[in-house]
Interface confidence: low
């Protein structure tokens, strides 16, 4: 749904502000710059992100922020341009390694 | 302190345009999606449009798309919402309202600070 | 679209009680995990404020006289004990598909 604004615009995260477990990789200059397509977000028994722009994009969990996060899961999250951390259990902070 | 300033509503007619701004001081602005709500005399909340923070992703109801316009300029901290073929059900007080979208390493869709709004009124 | 429908449309509680909101969705607005409902509290003259997130979670500054819960379709505001300033309109607010939508409001009056 619109959530994806924010699986989308990770990417574009300003470098300035500190929210926690946010991190902004290398920008793609090559990048377009507008486009109002709506991806939509993957649903058990939905539309599969069938409005998702062609265009791969690298996610720079399978490369330079492989690992990053200690105790958890990498996420890539478009629209943000950035990178964060989903915590196993118990764990927090950017990096997932505080306890 | 967070602070959204709205301006520019007004009366207008059926059919006219009206750009509503959105002024942002307390946080850094180019570091948040935004969003427009609007609510009806009827008190009734709608979604009307919101914008990524680098302005590449816009998003919109099926009630105003192809009508009204979403920007803005994070070198002047300022939303904007262009309005055209304006109607009379678009009638409403509109507020910004700024999107703080992850808490504790989890997206939650969040509008955390809202303006005072600024009220639009189409009438003939 | 999916439809966030509140009842009662108003109610009355007297000071000190337990006021119950309820705001139930037309479809599940839930998604890895978590529920992506929101509840708001605007009060005459003001723009809405932020009370709940993600059904459950209080957001800061706020009493933890107001509690959510719920998930799925059916989600729940409960204000317990009830103040004066706690007189506003409650509405619930989804995000899981959009477009975004809010319930119709709850109008609540202090006896």
């Known amino acids: 749904g619109l959530n994806d604004i924010f699986e989308a615009q990770k990417i574009e995260w300003h470098e300035s502000v500190r929210v926690e477990q946010v991190v902004k990789p290398p920008q793609n200059k090559t990048e377009s710059e507008n486009t109002s397509d709506k991806p939509k977000r993957k649903k058990k028994g939905g539309k599969n992100g069938k409005n998702r722009r062609n265009r791969k994009k690298k996610n720079p969990c399978n490369a330079e922020f492989q690992n990053f996060c200690i105790h958890g899961e990498c996420k890539y999250i478009e629209h943000l341009e950035a990178v964060t951390c989903k915590c196993q259990q118990e764990y927090f902070g950017e990096r997932c390694g505080e306890k | 302190e967070v602070k959204l300033m709205e301006s520019g509503g007004d009366l207008v007619k059926p059919g006219g345009s009206l750009k509503l701004s959105c002024v942002a001081s307390?946080?850094?602005?180019?570091?948040?999606?935004m969003s427009w709500v609007r609510q009806t005399p009827e008190k009734r909340l709608e979604w009307v449009a919101t914008?990524?923070?680098?302005?590449?992703?816009?998003y919109y109801p099926d009630s105003v798309k192809g009508r009204f316009t979403i920007s803005r300029d994070n070198a002047k901290n300022t939303l904007y919402l262009q309005m055209s073929s304006l109607r009379s059900e678009d009638t409403a007080m509109y507020y910004c309202a700024r999107h703080e979208g992850l808490r504790r390493g989890k997206y939650h869709c969040i509008m955390d600070y809202w303006g005072q709004g600024t009220s639009v009124t189409v009438s003939s | 679209d999916i439809l966030l429908t509140q009842s009662p449309a108003s109610l009355a509680v007297s000071l000190g009680q337990r006021a119950t909101i309820s705001c139930k969705a037309s479809q599940s607005i839930d998604y890895d995990g978590d529920s992506f409902l929101n509840w708001y509290q605007q009060k005459p003259g003001q723009p809405p404020k932020l009370l709940i997130y993600a059904a459950s979670n209080l957001e800061s500054g706020i009493p933890a006289r107001f509690s959510g819960s719920g998930s799925g379709t059916d989600f729940t505001l409960n204000i317990h004990p009830v103040e004066e300033e706690d007189a506003a309109t409650y509405y619930c607010h989804q995000c899981n598909e959009d477009p975004y939508m809010f319930g119709g409001g709850t109008k609540l009056e202090i006896r």
């Open positions: 307390g946080f850094t602005f180019s570091g948040y999606p």
């Open positions: 914008i990524s923070t680098g302005a590449r992703h816009t």
